[in-house]
């Protein structure tokens, strides 16, 4: 159980004051300088003032330094998501130094004491960052703090509180209660470091969010519209967990940020890209795939710097595990007329057909409406690189699905017994992909037959590079 | 080298407590977590839970929760294993083991086992 | 609780055969998977951590594969100080689980 420490007030200088007592009080936050990827190797352990240990542990004052920072625990021991970034990072980067900051015996108390602590524990990480700077070739510039959790508020504390700014701070999902809407100087924020960059997989508009929802970077990256995490659904978690709970399906989603960034570091060449946009339905919209004036990025490690004057939200659908990436594609459909309706919307999949593969059947996700006579615009995306498109079947669902459009088919025959068939008419659709920018035009095979009814298909064929319109920039032009 | 000594075999009542002690030495006691493993006779390895020395935080497995305490002496690098309102299926040798720092890490050392034996 | 299923739950070999003992969780366990030695009487010892990693002093003729849910654990060549109880134990997620042990007897 936790140990019952009181809140940063009372804590004052516990940190580092012997109590009168037989037994010295430790410090409550360590820097375990992590030597091996190897879990079992026990590291060594920096102190302010001591500089053995970094001679003894070869810490190399001119690499880069990574601190990680753990959140609040219920264990009181390092989980596994801490070990699979370490050894990350050691893959990654060979030479740097990468210290974990452990401050489990502040992390391992009620919630509320816990955050009370992290000004503390902000206070403990400058004041080492401090003393480094004071040694020859240290700079402030190659340290990145990378906080998970009630962690990242850690780091925005450390950031704040440090003689100079550090180079870079990664927040992975940082906590939501008690720090939603808090001021800026009790939360991470743009100005705790020269970039700052957030992934956020757990936020939500009901109940508790675990994670923050509102921006607090200089880009904060919402995956699959940072809240329901493919894979991590209470049917797949309690489908793998034999006495699973609600509780699994939270760790899934919450660690899910951790296991983005790993998964940027180990599978480099299969970068995610996250798009700005104003908001997680206009992305679902397929609105926003452009990358014109630094409107994409690589999502984590490789994530490139951009202080914006604005935080800028962007977004990204990803799988449902490790390499993550997905191929978005925007798909812009004109339908220039419109029979027989009725109240229900159709319900559209297609099926792209590209040089390296064919992919599954993929639903087009109406978010408001289909309009007629008007440009609809969907989004798309796929596991496998498909290659170049060729040609597309767009199908229109017959029977349908839910009992909600049962209903409203059978109140749309009720007051119209003797409706016609309904059809819409589709000439061509524009598509464009995210992750090359590329546009193409795909015309029906047939142009005489551009109609499209219940269960029937329609089949399109590129007929035209790009979309008579000024190129944009590819973002795999500009991987690091 | 890494040793843990526990102390020696107990014969208790039911509804008694015991309390088993687990001395470290060899490495930095509070460098690694101390876990508490029992065995009943003839059968598997049963987790109870653990200490982290360096602070003395806790985690117990549930089926123990209210009935194990564990605490630590650094002073002495001990850790100690009191269970409660003892009962015959009780009976087991009780283990002592160190891990490393993560979830991951693999009961490395273990001590040579504390025989509790409950009966009437 | 995550379940930890070894089989056989015994088998008898002799000196110098090759011996596989399988062990399977009731979920993913990330490879955070370790194996152990038990003889009569004694505590266990550590064996390989991590699925495959062999822990400092024991032979190289003991090695472990597996991912996911499936793991195992090879002797290549029977000694005779070989025959002992052996547990997998799931360091994936709390509580730590072990599995119900392989008595490897002699033939």
């Known amino acids: 159980s936790p140990v019952p420490f009181g809140p940063e007030g009372r804590l004052e200088d516990k940190l580092h004051k012997p109590k009168a007592t037989q037994t010295e009080v430790k410090p409550s936050v360590r820097f375990n300088l992590r030597t091996s990827k190897d879990p079992e190797h026990e590291g060594c352990y920096l102190s302010v003032g001591h500089s053995q240990p970094l001679e003894d542990c070869s810490f190399n004052m001119t690499a880069k330094t990574f601190f990680i920072i753990h959140g609040w625990t219920m264990s009181g021991i390092f989980e596994n998501w801490l070990h699979k970034l370490v050894s990350a990072l050691h893959t990654r980067e060979k030479d740097a130094n990468v210290v974990v900051v452990d401050w489990l015996p502040l992390a391992h108390q009620l919630y509320t004491d816990a955050v009370n602590n992290t000004r503390v524990v902000g206070h403990s990480i400058a004041r080492m960052l401090d003393w480094l700077q004071e040694k020859d070739d240290f700079s402030l510039g190659n340290v990145h703090l990378i906080g998970y959790s009630l962690g990242a508020h850690v780091a925005g504390y450390a950031g704040n509180f440090v003689k100079g700014t550090v180079g870079r701070i990664t927040g992975l999902d940082p906590a939501g209660p008690m720090f939603e809407g808090a001021d800026i100087h009790k939360r991470l924020s743009p100005d705790d470091a020269d970039f700052v960059d957030v992934l956020h997989t757990y936020t939500r508009s009901f109940g508790l969010s675990i994670g923050i929802q509102m921006p607090v970077g200089h880009i904060d990256i919402y995956p699959n519209g940072g809240d329901f995490q493919p894979g991590c659904g209470l049917n797949d978690v309690l489908g793998s967990i034999a006495y699973g709970t609600i509780t699994e399906v939270v760790k899934c989603e919450h660690e899910r940020a951790v296991h983005l960034f790993v998964d940027s570091l180990v599978n480099q060449d299969k970068p995610s890209f996250a798009f700005q946009c104003t908001d997680s339905n206009r992305f679902k919209k397929g609105i926003c795939l452009s990358c014109r004036k630094n409107r994409c990025n690589s999502i984590g490690y490789n994530a490139k710097k951009m202080r914006n004057k604005r935080n800028s939200k962007m977004y990204l659908k990803t799988r449902a595990g490790m390499p993550f990436r997905v191929y978005h594609y925007q798909m812009k459909i004109h339908v220039f007329s419109y029979k027989n309706m009725g109240e229900i919307e159709p319900t559209f999949y297609v099926t792209l057909y590209g040089t390296n593969a064919d992919s599954q059947t993929l639903p087009l996700e109406i978010v408001e409406r289909i309009e007629q006579n008007a440009t609809n615009t969907f989004l798309v995306y796929t596991e496998e690189d498909l290659g170049d498109l060729l040609k597309i079947q767009l199908t229109w669902e017959g029977a349908s699905q839910s009992w909600y459009n049962l209903w409203k088919e059978f109140r749309s025959y009720l007051s119209q017994p003797r409706n016609p068939g309904r059809e819409l008419n589709i000439r061509r659709i524009r598509v464009k992909s995210g992750e090359t920018q590329r546009k193409l035009t795909f015309c029906t095979e047939d142009p005489e037959n551009t109609s499209i009814s219940p269960g029937r298909e329609l089949w399109f064929r590129k007929c035209r590079d790009g979309w008579r319109m000024k190129n944009e920039t590819s973002p795999t032009v500009e991987l690091p | 080298q890494v040793q843990l000594v526990q102390s020696g075999a107990e014969v208790k009542k039911p509804g008694a407590s015991v309390k088993v002690s687990c001395k470290a030495s060899g490495y930095t006691f509070t460098d690694n977590t101390i876990h508490w493993v029992r065995q009943a006779p003839g059968q598997g390895l049963e987790w109870m839970g653990h200490i982290n020395p360096y602070y003395g935080g806790t985690n117990n497995n549930e089926k123990f929760k209210d009935r194990v305490t564990m605490t630590r002496d650094t002073s002495i690098s001990t850790a100690y294993m009191e269970l409660s309102r003892l009962r015959s299926d009780d009976t087991a040798v009780y283990y002592c083991?160190?891990?490393?720092?993560?979830?991951?890490?693999?009961?490395?050392?273990w001590g040579q086992g504390t025989t509790v034996t409950v009966s009437s | 609780d995550i379940q930890m299923t070894q089989s056989p739950s015994s088998l008898s070999a002799s000196v110098g055969d090759r011996v596989t003992i399988t062990c399977r969780a009731s979920q993913d366990i990330n490879n955070y998977l370790n194996w152990y030695q038990q003889k009569p009487g004694k505590a266990p010892k550590l064996l390989i951590y991590?699925?495959?990693k062999l822990h400092s002093g024991v032979p190289s003729r003991f090695s472990g594969s597996g991912s996911g849910t499936d793991f195992t654990l090879t002797i290549s060549s029977l000694q005779p100080e070989d025959f002992a109880t052996y547990y997998c134990?799931?360091?994936?997620?709390?509580?730590?689980?072990f599995g119900q042990g392989t008595k490897l007897e002699i033939k």
């Open positions: 134990q799931q360091g994936n997620t709390l509580p730590f689980t």
């Open positions: 083991a160190r891990k490393g720092i993560y979830y991951s890490s693999p009961f490395d050392y």
């Open positions: 991590y699925t495959s």
